[in-house]
Interface confidence: low
């Protein structure tokens, strides 16, 4: 028996599901008796779910996850995952015996959109040409961690004294905080842009400073 | 059926530190999440802060903040907290805790037996 | 912080007692509360989960209810192991909080 599987990883984003695609190839007058599936995780081989005996034996994983039955006897082995959680994330082997066997492991990314960035400036009033401030660019509930870029309005990177933070809460999706603090010209718009690198999603923040009032 | 084994009981002087370890069995040690969590004399139950191996991520409670380090060991299935510049009011028994599974971070089904851990010169 | 205050801090009853205990947040927590139990020198015990999920193994007689800011414990008819102390535990957001415990004597 060949089981194959996609080569690529699989995205799929937080708390949607997704399918980790695994097939083989039936013989003729070939019986679901015969076939043993499991799945595991690559690394710590755990039971993720399985289907012996002539029957599912079901989800040995947090019961999210689920096979084809209609669809194993052609050969379909793929696992459905349910609501996708950051911990999800990694390898999983698909292991096919029937007369003899072979296994094949597929890759899970998992990843979350960030929000849109919000802006805060310190100090927020009386500012003057040559005043330092402190910008700050809050993105939440993302993953994996982000790319934080700031630009000028020009479009043009602002690489001076730039502080940036990630911290996950309980479900591994990070808060990111990015502090700029820059010297004020007459007056400019600074730009902070959010990146995740899987989804390749980018999140925008800008704040325009004209004197006064400052627009968000 | 989770297990969780800590350390034994220690005696520290004020301003030293403490590594209590906590040895996980019956479980799949990387994806699920161990908290610390302390119990002065008398007193109620304070949660520190949680490590979750997997993610090789650790939060903390802002009061513990500095002072602690939550690490785990992936190999040995061991977490482990250590507490710095320890003062009288650290004199607590010191629990680890955890849900079981990926999916329970935040209630806690399994606890170690607990660390008494008395500061004192 | 999210802040539990628990009432009352003591209660004496007596064995086949219907007890009460509150729990009551300062913020609103949706339904992302835990009961425990626990008797001197042993670690807590999970009773409830969610509110008012009751944890596997848990006797039918402790249940779970409220949501937002204000929530109830009760033990329908109090039996000589359920003498210990009680704490509430929110999961809402980091940190972790626990209340500051009920104790049930004997009356």
């Known amino acids: 028996v060949e089981v194959q599987v996609s080569e690529d990883p699989v995205v799929a984003l937080v708390d949607t599901d997704a399918t980790l695609r695994c097939s083989f190839s039936p013989e003729p007058g070939f019986s679901l008796r015969q076939l043993n599936l499991i799945w595991q995780l690559t690394d710590t081989k755990q039971l993720v779910h399985s289907f012996t005996e002539g029957r599912d034996q079901g989800s040995a994983y947090a019961n999210r996850t689920a096979l084809f039955p209609d669809l194993l006897v052609q050969g379909n082995a793929s696992l459905r995952l349910q609501r996708v959680r950051v911990t999800d994330e990694g390898s999983y082997t698909c292991f096919v015996s029937i007369q003899d066997f072979d296994s094949a492991a597929v890759s899970l990314q998992v990843a979350a959109p960030y929000s849109k960035p919000s802006m805060t400036l310190e100090p927020n009033k009386d500012l003057r040409p040559g005043d330092m401030v402190t910008i700050t660019c809050s993105s939440y509930q993302g993953y994996p961690e982000a790319e934080v870029f700031w630009k000028d309005g020009q479009g043009l990177p602002l690489t001076g004294n730039v502080t940036t933070s990630q911290m996950a809460n309980e479900r591994g999706l990070f808060d990111v905080h990015s502090v700029l603090r820059v010297v004020l010209g007459a007056n400019g718009t600074y730009s902070c842009l959010v990146r995740n690198p899987v989804l390749q999603q980018d999140a925008h923040g800008s704040v325009t400073i004209t004197g006064q009032p400052m627009t968000f | 059926q989770v297990q969780l084994v800590e350390s034994g009981a220690e005696v520290k002087k004020p301003g030293s530190s403490v590594k209590v370890s906590c040895k996980a069995s019956?479980?799949?040690?990387?994806?699920?999440?161990i908290s610390w969590v302390r119990q002065a004399p008398g007193q109620g139950l304070e949660w520190m802060g949680r490590?979750?191996?997997?993610?090789?991520?650790?939060n903390y409670a802002q009061k513990f903040q500095g002072r602690v380090t939550i690490t785990a060991d992936k190999s040995t299935s061991t977490a482990y907290m250590e507490l710095s510049s320890l003062r009288s009011e650290d004199t607590a028994v010191y629990y680890c805790?955890?849900?079981?599974?990926?999916?329970?971070?935040?209630?806690?089904?399994?606890w170690g037996q607990g660390t008494l851990i008395t500061v004192s010169s | 912080d999210i802040q539990m205050t628990q009432s009352p801090s003591t209660l004496s009853a007596s064995v086949g007692d219907r007890v009460t205990i509150t729990c009551r947040a300062s913020?609103?927590?949706?339904?992302?509360l835990a009961w425990y139990q626990q008797k001197p020198g042993k670690a807590p015990k999970l009773l409830i989960y969610?509110?008012?999920s009751l944890q596997s193994g848990v006797p039918s007689r402790f249940s779970g209810s409220g949501s937002g800011t204000e929530f109830t414990l009760t033990i329908s008819s109090l039996q000589p192991d359920d003498f210990a102390s009680y704490y509430c535990?929110?999961?809402?957001?980091?940190?972790?909080?626990f209340g500051g415990g009920t104790k049930v004597e004997i009356k």
């Open positions: 805790a955890n849900g079981g599974d990926s999916s329970s971070w935040y209630t806690f089904d399994y």
């Open positions: 019956g479980g799949t040690f990387s994806s699920y999440a």
């Open positions: 490590i979750i191996p997997i993610l090789g991520i650790a």
């Open positions: 913020q609103s927590i949706d339904n992302w």
């Open positions: 969610k509110a008012s």
């Open positions: 535990q929110q999961y809402d957001s980091n940190p972790l909080t």
